[in-house]
Interface confidence: medium
């Protein structure tokens, strides 16, 4: 009804003598803002109809005081009972210690103003601690994760309990193998109160039938326990035996497969056999109860491998361990592997003999071009530095205690090397003359792989007519030595070949050896004919003066040079190829003025009144720089020019005239020349 209280707590609370009970409790009064005034806890209560009051043993009684209307009721302890609630909504209680005779109904009487409520709370207190419960799944399978739950409908703060797990009396902890986790939890709510431990693990098939125990402990003392037995379902467990495990070809082998255990049991024993993971078919089998026999009569090498057997129950197929059957046989036909191939000359090469054999081959014979190589009996043949000599076909024979194999396949060792013995050959007629065309051929002795290209040095020295042939169109006198390279994947260069081009002497010139300065008449003069190069080196020298041959020899000598020796001189050098003329070299002899002569124009007899020009003619080198004129009395006429002009002439001008000439070398004087001035007809007429 509207004035009903709502009170929530667990239906029944469980405990045992000496423990405690905590009663989680929540309430709501009919009036929203009402507060508890009084709380009573009865034991074995009854309602007195006469007094209309509840009677019984009071375990707890608390009332709000008038002095402090707001004072709280909680955390007050009376005897064994502690009120852990409040005046609004919490009515939690704790009884410690609890007695077996506390079993039955408690009455919780609550008053809030005019509103009252009596709430029955049922306690089940046993004399001894009760057993925990164990929950487990209906089916447990090997290696599959399973969770077991151990629980107890009890929890009370101040009386701690511990749940421990045991497998066959050995404690299980979180570090036990195959255990995933152990988790404990305590629940204390208005719905229920319990303590639980969950054990998650992966059972092995060998755990089948083993006991699992959950133990309740308080202060290291065992209070109670419960034991269950594990029913682990697992696939059949099979045991395989091979006799013998090592057998020679053509002998027989028996394999047995026994079913040692299965849960659930096998309906029928149907054993399957597998080799290297594949089912075996068409084999002779003998099936017995819990056992199967596989008989291999005449073993071949293909029968070697890993064998196992399989049988199934409702859980699934169970497999035995794998057992290896070794079949011994003589080596199989061999083949050779070469690393690297092709090989580079000078490289390290390894040849490996591949031949299946059981037991492994112990001895190997190596062959090069079908000839045995003594001394090396290993599976690997190593050539530290391979040379073209090592090229060829290699094979090997493997041997074990059962015999030796055959040669299946030879391997070819190809040794690559750069072209060998490369030479540059001149194909033209010799000697080669300047301006000739020259053909050069690049030759080599051997190459692997074949030569694919050629190179020439210096580059661009000619045109390539075809691979390995170079044409130099017009060879110069100073042609560089030419070298060629023949190339496959590597290039080999020939030594440079000198073309030895023949040419006429070059850069011929005249050198003045002495004197060091200008040449003056009477001095000793020595000229030398010089040139830069000549091939062939044997030469002859010739001298020409003004185009005419003068003499042969390297030097041209003048004991006392005279002005008549002046002129253009050429030096000429020749060898067997040709001759080369130097540029003209002008010999200039310096001398003082000589052969001075006075010439009179228009003549040496001139009429008075006319004009006469006297010229001082001479031979001088360098030319005369200063002239001096004298009359018959030796008087200096103070005229410094080459010409002396007399105008107008007078009879007194008659007489002899001389001139003197001076240059940087010296002075020369002319003999006198006579000028006769005669009277004009006018003058004669006057007289």
């Amino acid at each position: 009804s509207a004035n009903d209280w709502t009170v929530d707590h667990p239906q029944t609370l469980f405990a045992w003598e000496g423990a405690c009970i905590r009663i989680p409790c929540k309430y709501k009064t009919p009036l929203p803002k009402a507060r508890l005034d009084n709380i009573l806890l009865f034991q074995n209560y009854e309602f007195d109809k006469a007094t209309k009051k509840f009677t019984g043993t009071v375990l707890y009684n608390a009332t709000k005081t008038e002095k402090d209307p707001e004072s709280e009721l909680y955390l007050s302890k009376q005897g064994r009972v502690t009120f852990l609630g409040n005046r609004i909504d919490n009515c939690t209680l704790k009884i410690h210690p609890i007695r077996a005779n506390d079993s039955g109904n408690l009455g919780l009487r609550m008053t809030a103003g005019t509103e009252r409520w009596m709430e029955p709370i049922h306690l089940n207190v046993s004399e001894k601690p009760f057993q925990p419960y164990i929950q487990m799944p209906s089916e447990i399978r090997e290696s599959q994760s399973v969770t077991l739950t151990c629980g107890l409908n009890f929890s009370c703060f101040g009386y701690d309990i511990l749940l421990k797990w045991f497998l066959e009396d050995s404690e299980i902890t979180s570090i036990t193998s195959s255990v995933t986790s152990i988790t404990s939890s305590v629940t204390s709510s208005i719905k229920n109160v319990y303590t639980e431990s969950k054990l998650t693990f992966q059972p092995k098939w060998t755990d089948h039938g083993k006991s699992v125990k959950c133990q309740v402990q308080h202060s290291s003392k065992v209070l109670s326990e419960r034991t269950v037995r594990l029913d682990v379902k697992y696939t059949p467990k099979l045991e395989i035996k091979v006799n013998p495990t090592e057998v020679e070809k053509n002998n027989s082998v028996t394999m047995t497969c026994r079913v040692n255990s299965s849960n659930p049991k096998l309906r029928t024993v149907a054993v399957s056999w597998f080799k290297d993971g594949r089912p075996l078919e068409d084999q002779e089998l003998e099936q017995e109860q819990q056992m199967s026999k596989l008989i291999l009569h005449s073993v071949t090498k293909d029968m070697r491998g890993k064998y196992r057997c399989q049988a199934s129950n409702d859980i699934g197929p169970g497999e035995s361990e794998e057992v290896e059957l070794t079949v011994h046989y003589a080596p199989e036909p061999s083949r050779v592997h070469i690393y690297p191939s092709p090989a580079e000359e000078g490289q390290s090469v390894e040849l490996i003999c591949e031949s299946l054999a059981s037991p492994s081959a112990t001895n190997y014979t190596w062959y090069h071009n079908r000839k045995p190589i003594p001394g090396d009996t290993q599976e690997k043949l190593r050539i530290p530095k391979v040379s073209p000599w090592h090229a060829g076909n290699y094979s090997c024979l493997a041997e074990n205690r059962l015999g030796h194999g055959k040669i299946d396949q030879e391997a070819k060792l190809d040794v690559h090397y750069a072209p060998k013995a490369v030479t540059t050959v001149i194909q033209s007629f010799t000697p080669i003359l300047e301006g000739d065309s020259v053909t050069l051929v690049c030759r080599y002795n051997s190459s692997n792989p074949d030569v694919t290209s050629y190179r020439w040095n210096p580059q661009g020295s000619g045109s390539v007519l075809k691979p390995g042939v170079l044409r130099i169109q017009k060879v110069t006198w100073d042609s560089m030595p030419v070298s060629c390279a023949a190339c496959n994947h590597k290039c080999s260069w020939a030594l440079p070949v000198i073309l030895n081009v023949h040419y006429a002497p070059r850069d011929v010139k005249v050198l003045k050896v002495s004197p060091a300065s200008e040449i003056r008449a009477g001095q000793r003069v020595l000229l030398q004919c010089d040139f830069a190069e000549s091939n062939p080196a044997e030469v002859r020298f010739f001298w020409k003066k003004n185009g005419s041959l003068v003499q042969e020899g390297r030097y041209l000598s003048f004991g006392s040079v005279s002005p008549e020796d002046s002129g253009n001189y050429n030096c000429m050098v020749n060898n067997s190829i040709g001759e080369t003329l130097s540029q003209a070299w002008n010999l200039q002899v310096l001398y003082a003025p000589r052969r001075l002569r006075v010439s009179i124009s228009p003549g040496d007899h001139v009429m008075e009144g006319k004009k006469a020009t006297l010229s001082c003619e001479s031979d001088a080198n360098p030319p005369i720089s200063q002239y001096t004129w004298f009359d018959s009395s030796g008087q200096d006429l103070h005229s410094s020019g080459q010409k002396l002009r007399l105008e107008p002439l007078e009879v007194q001008h008659t007489g002899s005239y001389r001139c003197k000439g001076t240059n940087g070398i010296g002075t020369g004087e002319s003999p006198p020349s006579t000028l006769t001035v005669y009277y004009s007809p006018e003058t004669i007429g006057k007289r």
Partner: nanobody, 122 residues
């Protein structure tokens, strides 16, 4: 080009000794085999003795073991075959050969010389 020139052959009485020389030139490989084989008229070629240049290891045909010794002089590029206790069946043309391997039948992929005649009289 490899050139091998043999010398030292001749006529000798049974039980006598001879020393054959082989002057080698033009071998460019660091690791090669050099040795002797012989050929008697109408018979197959037979390897006599061989040695490797790299380590000096030697090989002998069973018929000459203990009687013949192969040696070399690196400075002179010469290989020698000292033949003691000669027998009439040792009569043959002895060739010097060079190649990559020592073989029972001689030297593989050979370059060989003209040979020198050895005659053992009884």
């Amino acid at each position: 080009q490899v050139q091998l020139v043999e010398s030292g052959g001749g006529l000798v009485q049974a039980g006598g000794s001879l020393r054959l020389s082989c002057a080698a030139s033009g071998i460019t490989s660091d690791d090669y085999a050099i040795g002797w084989f012989r050929q008697a008229p109408g018979k197959e070629r037979e390897g006599v003795s061989c040695m490797y240049s790299s380590d000096g290891s030697t090989y002998y045909a069973d018929s000459v073991k203990g009687r013949f010794t192969i040696s070399r002089d690196n400075a002179k590029n010469t290989v020698y075959l000292q033949m003691n206790s000669l027998r009439p069946e040792d009569t043959a043309v002895y060739h010097c050969a060079a190649g990559p391997w020592c073989f029972v039948t001689g030297v593989g992929r050979e370059e060989w010389g003209q040979g020198t005649q050895v005659t053992v009289s009884s």
